[in-house]
């Protein structure tokens, strides 16, 4: 070949300036012997570009571009041949920036699949490819001191969430966590956690279900509803506190909120509703007094109140 | 010191009945599900039944359900065990157990042998 | 009822050796399996919860691995105070069965 670019840096900031140098060796005899060296990035001429003969024949052109401002483009150097340019060689430029410290950690541990998931925001676009590692480590106390290194957590392309699996991680022990972010500008990293898997257990939640109707219970009092739940099996060893939405299937009623409820009630009577009307009912659930993460709302449950208008308003529980 | 410690076993005729106690020091004993475990002379570990912290729950092996019944007195700090019709392969040691919130059994008493035979 | 199945039900080994024992459950239990060594006359010990959680206290020879229905104990080097019965656990189902035991004799 006959050209060879050279740059300061092929990946620099954004704005920030770069500097190229095109040698043309002496043996392309086939070229005019005071050739004029053009510069192109993209598809448009630079001007600025300095050019002498070194002593050794070969001919040299400096250009400085003062911003690089495109994220991405070829920086080509050229000369006229004919009535075309003939490209000597080209480089890819790259521009962008460091990687912000990825913010807004946070991990759950699910028990089902037996692994810790942790989430981040990785912050502002870099324009340069940018990988994200999630780091940990085991602490017999508060993580000031490291035990033993957890394997990284690479997650895929584009993902912003990783998961721990159960073989890395020590239940009812600290670990240190952190997210490293990196590219060829520069590595940040998140503010350190640390947590013990528990803590942040998210638990599924119980099963909704209408109470069966026995003979020996009372039938519900107008403008009350009788239900009852089923918990997650796994999770019943584990404290919890539980509460219940309900809303008006019809209407634009918000959410009303009832709880604390032990899950070990099981049953439940709730009154002081609309009679003759369609209710919509949720339940969720949180280790307690320990802590742990709500876990997602349960699957709806639809239940209708009796016809007769309520004569009083009351909250009642059944143990 | 934690520990757990099982009482009321004995030698019980056919079709009688027995209770034993589990008194429990060390630990915040509200706060824990607590179960039965026995063991038959020469044989291995059958879970018995299991008891919610408040009590609430109450789950029993199929061999159990209908005669025993399994209760808490968080104020005493002490499990029971009320074993009613019993019969002879009810024979065994029967352990006092702490569980934890997998459902493990992080802490045994000693045992206590119960026998029912004529 | 998920039943719990142990194998082998006893074996013999030296002090030294690597010792394996399997569990596996008749139905998906996630990694709710715990192992408990047992010595005569004695309580049950908990060794290890959760599939691979050891107990503390409990040496690092022991270690526990495998999720959904299949289980393994591995002792990494057989110390004398190791011969006993081994148990596992499971507790995804609030019933809580425990396999038959495995009986690790000195050969």
């Known amino acids: 070949e006959c050209g060879h670019i050279s740059v300061s840096a092929p990946i620099v900031h954004l704005g920030d300036p770069i500097t190229a140098s095109c040698i043309i060796k002496q043996n392309c005899s086939h070229l005019d012997p005071e050739p004029q060296i053009l510069w192109r990035l993209g598809a448009e001429l630079q001007p600025g570009g300095r050019q002498q003969r070194l002593s050794d024949g070969t001919q040299e052109s400096i250009i400085t571009l003062p911003h690089l401002n495109h994220t991405q483009a070829f920086l080509s150097c050229a000369l006229n041949w004919g009535n075309s340019l003939q490209i000597l060689d080209q480089v890819e430029l790259r521009a962008g920036y460091p990687p912000a410290i990825p913010h807004n950690l946070s991990c759950l541990m699910n028990l089902t699949t037996s692994s810790l998931i942790c989430q981040w925001e990785p912050g502002p676009e870099t324009h340069l490819p940018t990988s994200f590692t999630l780091k940990s480590f085991k602490s017999r106390g508060n993580c000031q001191t490291q035990g033993d290194s957890i394997l990284d957590c690479v997650p895929k392309d584009g993902q912003s969430h990783c998961s721990i699996p159960r073989k890395h991680l020590l239940l009812y022990q600290n670990m240190g966590i952190w997210v490293q972010a990196e590219n060829a500008l520069g590595t940040s990293m998140s503010p350190q956690l640390c947590l013990d898997p528990m803590d942040v257990v998210k638990l599924e939640p119980p099963m909704l279900r209408t109470m069966d109707p026995s003979p020996e219970a009372a039938p519900p009092q107008a403008g009350c509803l009788q239900l009852s739940w089923e918990p997650w099996q796994p999770g019943l060893h584990i404290n919890q506190k539980c509460e219940l939405r309900h809303k008006p299937q019809r209407g634009e009623a918000s959410w009303a909120l009832v709880g604390p409820l032990p899950l070990e009630a099981l049953q439940y009577e709730l009154c002081g509703l609309l009679p003759a009307t369609a209710y919509t009912l949720q339940i969720r659930c949180i280790r307690w007094p320990l802590p742990g993460h709500w876990s997602d709302w349960s699957p709806s449950l639809e239940l209708r109140t009796t016809e007769r208008a309520p004569t009083h308003h009351h909250h009642h529980h059944h143990h | 010191e934690v520990q757990l410690l099982e009482s009321g076993g004995g030698l019980v005729q056919p079709g009688g009945s027995l209770r034993l106690s589990c008194a429990a020091s060390?630990?915040?004993?509200?706060?824990?599900?607590m179960g039965w475990v026995r063991q038959a002379p020469g044989k291995g570990l059958e879970w018995v039944s299991s008891i919610s912290s408040s009590g609430g729950v109450t789950p029993y092996a199929d061999s159990v359900k209908g005669r025993f019944t399994i209760s808490r007195d968080n104020s005493k700090n002490t499990l029971y065990l009320q074993m009613n019709s019993l019969r002879a392969e009810d024979t065994a040691v029967y352990y006092c157990?702490?569980?934890?919130?997998?459902?493990?059994?992080?802490?045994w008493g000693q045992g206590t042998l119960v026998t029912v035979s004529s | 009822d998920i039943q719990m199945t142990q194998s082998p039900s006893s074996l013999s080994a030296s002090v030294g050796d690597r010792v394996t024992i399997t569990c596996r459950a008749s139905?998906?239990?996630?990694?709710?399996l715990n192992w408990y060594q047992q010595k005569p006359g004695k309580a049950p010990k908990l060794l290890i919860y959760y599939a691979s959680n050891l107990q503390n206290g409990v040496p690092s020879r022991f270690s526990g691995s495998g999720s959904g229905t299949d289980f393994t104990l591995t002792i990494s080097s057989l110390q004398p105070e190791d011969f006993a019965t081994y148990y596992c656990?499971?507790?995804?189902?609030?019933?809580?069965?425990f396999g038959g035991g495995t009986k690790v004799e000195i050969k």
């Open positions: 157990a702490k569980l934890g919130e997998l459902g493990q059994s992080m802490l």
């Open positions: 656990q499971q507790s995804w189902q609030i019933k809580l069965k």
């Open positions: 060390g630990f915040t004993f509200s706060l824990y599900w």
């Open positions: 139905q998906g239990i996630s990694s709710y």
